[in-house]
């Protein structure tokens, strides 16, 4: 069978793809349709976030749309198809043996997805093998109601996982960001993402990445030496999408990892990150759950200083102000801290070298019954020029073997009221977190504290 898709998309004929891929299909580019669609496009980008329960912000501080609200809205918008890529699914409390009222939003989302299927809207899910949620029944429940589900064997194919988290709705709307399909992502974990509405060009481009997962989810799938042309991207760092987002001139493109899942024209995720860092002249602010200039999932670990070097070079060579805000929770690997201290040690204000590192600690409070939660899970970066919103933690595996995506957006300042560009909105969210009492300098994060809130 083929993933149902909006009717305006062409179907690839079996002769266009290797025989082993005939179970799947990929979008064909139809210039006339695309042109018609572009005229109807009125792209809009909304930043979305989850703030864990009982994590109050200072009054009047900036905020983004709540993620749970945005997801439910997207599903209300759906008319034909919803395609979801997610590392794992765990939308109900019983999935993880937890009885907690904060799981209700996830359970409502699962209900909404079932209702969607009842309305004859197609749901296609690409998820990872290996996965974290081996006891979850979400996907069985959805499959029983007609959802199409494929496990992508990234462990076998690339020795990684499918770590992407994105939706494509009706080939027109997009969610992408740090949040997995997990109830904790809505109420117990700090997340950051973006929803793009009415933007079929970008949606269809991201759909091509979904299709790379889809064809790899058939039995005995192998990685192609070269991806067929219909998987190629027209938008990349050299040729981004140009459009008006709410009337604001905007360039945007999606990047992907690992390289083996980057068909022609697709910018590699690492290259996108480095390009955004490299173009910064004033500041680089990054908020990531993990920062390791090493591999994470291979024995023994290898040193991998690519991102570390880029931050150091920006700070030391160009006087760019670097701020790194790293997640810190009960399940944070403490071997990360020496690398953070090493980066911070480069800072030398007298020589105009500014590198600051903090950890963001979400107080556990009375939520200790919820495992793998209460952490800043965001993966974004902002400079004065661009916003980068990703799905990857910052260590080698996420760029070399693990499937992820990134979104790079640049908006023209001056064409709209001050503070309205995406990069300015993201900077404000970063600075809110950076200046909050939950952001702790490394000096205040003594070894052995295990990321426990000392507030």
């Amino acid at each position: 069978w083929q993933v149902p898709r909006p009717p305006t998309w062409g179907q690839v004929q079996p002769k266009d793809v290797p025989r082993s891929w005939e179970h799947g299909s990929s979008p064909a580019w139809e210039p006339l349709e695309a042109e018609a669609r572009q005229q109807r496009d009125s792209c809009q980008l909304v930043l979305v976030e989850s703030i864990p329960q009982d994590l109050p912000s200072a009054a009047g501080s900036p905020s983004a749309q709540p993620l749970g609200q945005a997801w439910l809205q997207l599903l209300d918008t759906a008319q034909e198809s919803v395609h979801v890529a997610s590392y794992y699914w765990s939308l109900t409390g019983p999935d993880i043996g937890v009885n907690d009222s904060s799981s209700q939003l996830g359970e409502a989302l699962l209900q909404k997805l079932q209702q969607l299927l009842g309305r004859n809207i197609s749901l296609a899910v690409a998820t990872s093998s290996p996965t974290l949620a081996r006891t979850s029944t979400d996907l069985q429940v959805l499959a029983a109601r007609g959802a199409h589900v494929r496990q992508v064997p990234m462990g076998r194919l690339t020795r990684g996982v499918l770590h992407s988290k994105f939706w494509v709705v009706d080939g027109r709307h997009i969610y992408m960001g740090s949040a997995n399909m997990d109830w904790r992502s809505l109420t117990q974990v700090k997340e950051l993402g973006a929803v793009i509405y009415n933007c079929s060009h970008l949606a269809q481009d991201l759909e091509k990445t979904f299709q790379t997962y889809w064809v790899l989810g058939v039995p005995k799938a192998v990685l192609p030496k070269t991806w067929p042309q219909n998987f190629s991207s027209h938008f990349n760092r050299f040729q981004p999408f140009h459009g008006l987002f709410d009337g604001v001139p905007t360039t945007a493109y999606f990047s992907a990892s690992p390289p083996a899942l980057c068909p022609q024209g697709r910018t590699r995720d690492l290259e996108a990150l480095l390009a955004v860092m490299g173009s910064a002249q004033e500041f680089i602010y990054a908020s990531v759950m993990e920062y390791f200039p090493t591999t994470r999932f291979s024995h023994p670990p290898r040193y991998w200083p690519v991102l570390d070097n880029a931050l150091r070079a920006a700070a030391f060579g160009k006087g760019v102000r670097v701020r790194l805000l790293v997640g810190c929770g009960l399940n944070t690997d403490p071997t990360m801290f020496p690398y953070l201290r090493s980066l911070q040690a480069l800072s030398n204000p007298a020589a105009n070298v500014s590198v600051d590192v903090k950890v963001f600690i979400v107080p556990v409070g009375n939520h200790s019954n919820i495992p793998f939660s209460r952490v800043n899970h965001s993966k974004f970066m902002v400079t004065e020029k661009a916003a980068y919103i990703g799905t990857s933690n910052w260590s080698e595996d996420y760029f070399s073997s693990t499937a992820g995506v990134g979104l790079v957006v640049t908006q023209s300042p001056g064409a709209q009221p001050a503070g309205a560009t995406v990069q300015e909105q993201l900077r404000q969210l970063f600075e809110r977190d950076w200046s909050s009492r939950y952001a702790v300098g490394l000096d205040g994060q003594a070894p052995g504290q295990d990321c426990v809130w000392q507030g």
């Epitope: 290996p130 081996r134 993990e290 009960l330 200790s368 952490v375």
Partner: antibody
Framework: DVQLQESGPGLVKPSQSLSLTCSVT???????YYWSWIRQFPGNRLEWM?????????NYNPSLKNRISITRDTSKNQFFLKLNSVTTEDTATYNC?????????????????WGAGTTVTVSS | DIQMTQTTSSLSASLGGSVTISCRAS??????LNWYQQKPDGTVKLLIY???RLHSGVPSRFSGSGSGTDYSLTISNLEQEDIATYFC?????????FGGGTKLEIK
């Protein structure tokens, strides 16, 4: 270097309780792992009995559910096994082991450190 | 519970040769399989996790493969120190379960 060492009586009478201690050095039992008990019966068969998590929560093998309790003392970095109403069928070598690592996002779990084991005979 | 079966309880091979030990699960465990070595003195050591990934410090003579319900551990260029019993273990679901073990002897 992380080390686990089991201790406790080598002989227990039927119907009594078996109590063992696992002393952990080189790593905090409040961090990042499940701390398990695994036993090996004469003839080599291994049985996972249960764990206490870094956060103090438990999970037990359903075959032992009504008889087993795993607790801990974080100040001494020790965790304990108590098995009630033992019979001769519980004669085995008892090992403690850690399973993980339970870092965010890591899907690969394994028993990477084992104790040497302590032999317990149930006999009157 | 998932049953893990190692049909061969013991086998012998020559030094320098190679040997394959197999393990079968009662249902698909989706590659969530680990291999352990237990020396004659009772010491247990992790060799391979997630079907085929070598743990730190384990010689590359050890390799693992498999999928679905069928898995295997191969030891090539056998050395005297490989005399041990080898166990498979699934971590797909709780309770964790182990195979019955395969004892390796040198001819």
């Amino acid at each position: 270097d992380v080390q686990l060492q089991e201790s406790g009586p080598g002989l227990v009478k039927p119907s009594q309780s078996l109590s063992l201690t696992c002393s952990v050095t080189g790593y905090s039992i409040s961090s990042h792992y499940y701390w398990s008990w695994i036993r090996q019966f004469p003839g080599n068969r291994l049985e996972w009995m249960g764990y206490i998590s870094y956060d103090g929560s438990n999970n037990y093998n359903p075959s032992l559910k009504n008889r087993i309790s795993i607790t801990r003392d974080t100040s001494k970095n020790q965790f304990f096994l108590k098995l009630n109403s033992v019979t001769t069928e519980d004669t085995a070598t008892y090992n403690c082991a850690r399973e993980g690592p339970l870092y965010y996002g890591n899907p690969y779990w394994y028993f990477d450190v084992w104790g040497a084991g302590t032999t317990v005979t149930v006999s009157s | 519970d998932i049953q893990m079966t190692q049909t061969t309880s013991s086998l012998s091979a020559s030094l320098g040769g190679s040997v394959t030990i197999s393990c079968r699960a009662s249902q698909d465990i989706d590659n969530y399989l680990n291999w352990y070595q237990q020396k004659p003195d009772g010491t247990v050591k992790l060799l391979i996790y997630y079907t085929s990934r070598l743990h730190s410090g384990v010689p590359s003579r050890f390799s693992g493969s498999g999928s679905g319900t069928d898995y295997s551990l191969t030891i090539s260029n056998l050395e005297q120190e490989d005399i041990a019993t080898y166990f498979c273990q699934q971590f797909n679901t709780l309770p964790r379960t182990f195979g019955g073990g395969t004892k390796l002897e040198i001819k």
